[in-house]
């Protein structure tokens, strides 16, 4: 089948990094500068993505693969393939339409991106607050109040802080 196909369509012989040039009797020509073809048999090469301005190049374009971008310092990627760059905020803040705003009381953000999330409610797990929360850090839950009553033979070691979920890239 492959042999039959190549006899019928000379373009199927053109490898990645080339295109089937109709202007030159369907011979395989290398992709011009700033373009690529990631598969064989292409009739055109695709333009390389340009990582300029707020974007910067993470991986250079080659004749067989597109460029990959990330964001300049102070910004982070959003969307598939870093389609957008969003402003970083400080820990303890979240990005709103009006810029970076401090987390409201009772919420925290331990990253430079994403939203402020509520402190863990220790009492839901039958525990007490061992370390108070801040804008930048979740509360640390400790042993239940009953475990701390006088005469208790031992103190339960504090439970590790709940791992905050990471906001999507």
């Amino acid at each position: 089948f492959e042999r039959t196909r190549s006899l019928q369509d000379p373009c199927s012989n053109c490898p990645a990094g080339t295109f089937c040039d109709n202007n030159r009797n369907q011979i395989c020509s290398p992709c011009p500068p700033n373009s690529f073809s990631s598969a064989g048999g292409q009739r055109t090469c695709d333009i390389c993505r340009q990582c300029k301005g707020v974007f910067r190049t993470r991986k250079e374009c080659s004749s067989t693969s597109n460029a990959e971008c990330d964001c300049t310092p102070g910004f982070h990627c959003l969307g598939a393939g870093c389609s957008m760059c969003e402003q970083d905020c400080k820990q303890g803040q979240e990005l709103t339409k009006k810029g970076c705003k401090d987390c409201c009381f009772g919420t925290f953000n331990d990253q430079k991106r994403g939203i402020c999330r509520p402190w863990t409610n220790c009492s839901l797990d039958g525990k007490s607050v061992l370390v108070n929360g801040t804008k930048e850090r979740d509360v640390v839950c400790g042993p239940s109040p009953a475990d701390l009553s006088p005469g208790a033979s031992s103190v339960t070691p504090p439970a590790p802080a709940r791992e905050p979920g990471h906001s999507p890239q």
């Epitope: 700033n34 373009s35 333009i47 340009q50 707020v54 300049t72 910004f75 760059c85 969003e86």
Partner: antibody, heavy 118, light 110 residues
Framework: QLQLQESGPGLVRPSETLSLTCTVS????????WTWIRQPPGKALEWIGY???????RYSPSLKSRVSMSVDTSRNQFSLHLNSVTAADTAVYYC????????????WGRGTLVTVSS | QSVVTQPPSASGTPGQRVTISCSGS????????VSWYQHVPGTAPKLLIY???QRPSGVPDRFSGSKSGTSASLAISGLQSEDEADYYC???????????LGGGTKVTVL
Amino acid sequence: QLQLQESGPGLVRPSETLSLTCTVSGGSISSFYWTWIRQPPGKALEWIGYIYHNGYSRYSPSLKSRVSMSVDTSRNQFSLHLNSVTAADTAVYYCARANNDYLFFDLWGRGTLVTVSS
Amino acid sequence: QSVVTQPPSASGTPGQRVTISCSGSRSNIGSNIVSWYQHVPGTAPKLLIYGNAQRPSGVPDRFSGSKSGTSASLAISGLQSEDEADYYCATWDDSLSGWVLGGGTKVTVL
């Protein structure tokens, strides 16, 4: 269909600040580079600067000391401010959208003539 | 004075082929892609070519673009009276972190 429309005063006094707004209708201002380009009478198009939806901006070196841009994502608008204007700033001012992956201006406003005169 | 240079004028009779050059340097055309615009005074500029040689839908195939080294060119084959306009090349300049536009070429159909 996405459209751009420039608005602002058609006459500005010398030494004052020229302020123009470009309203983006029929689509979002998120992503893309939003640019200002001008054409003085009888002269070539001149790139002024761009702003990204997150506020990141860059300006032409020849205008850098006098120009600033801002963006209001809630209103889908971006603005140009050019201070200490002279008669040489008289021009048709265009706002345009630039594709941030392939860096071409694919959508333009109709342009607005700003005259600097006393 | 633009850092990207174009001839101020070009002309041809209907049906002829006209080529406009756009010359730059390593920091702009040499390392970036080029776009071309048609500008009829009193109207908004129109995108003709992007990515050195790609035509947006709706642009006649009489318009073609190419790039080699630090120069680019726009060719108009089968020149028509409605092609009379100013033509501009544009590209990114890495040293400016912004765009540069050529000085424009006025095409006259004789």
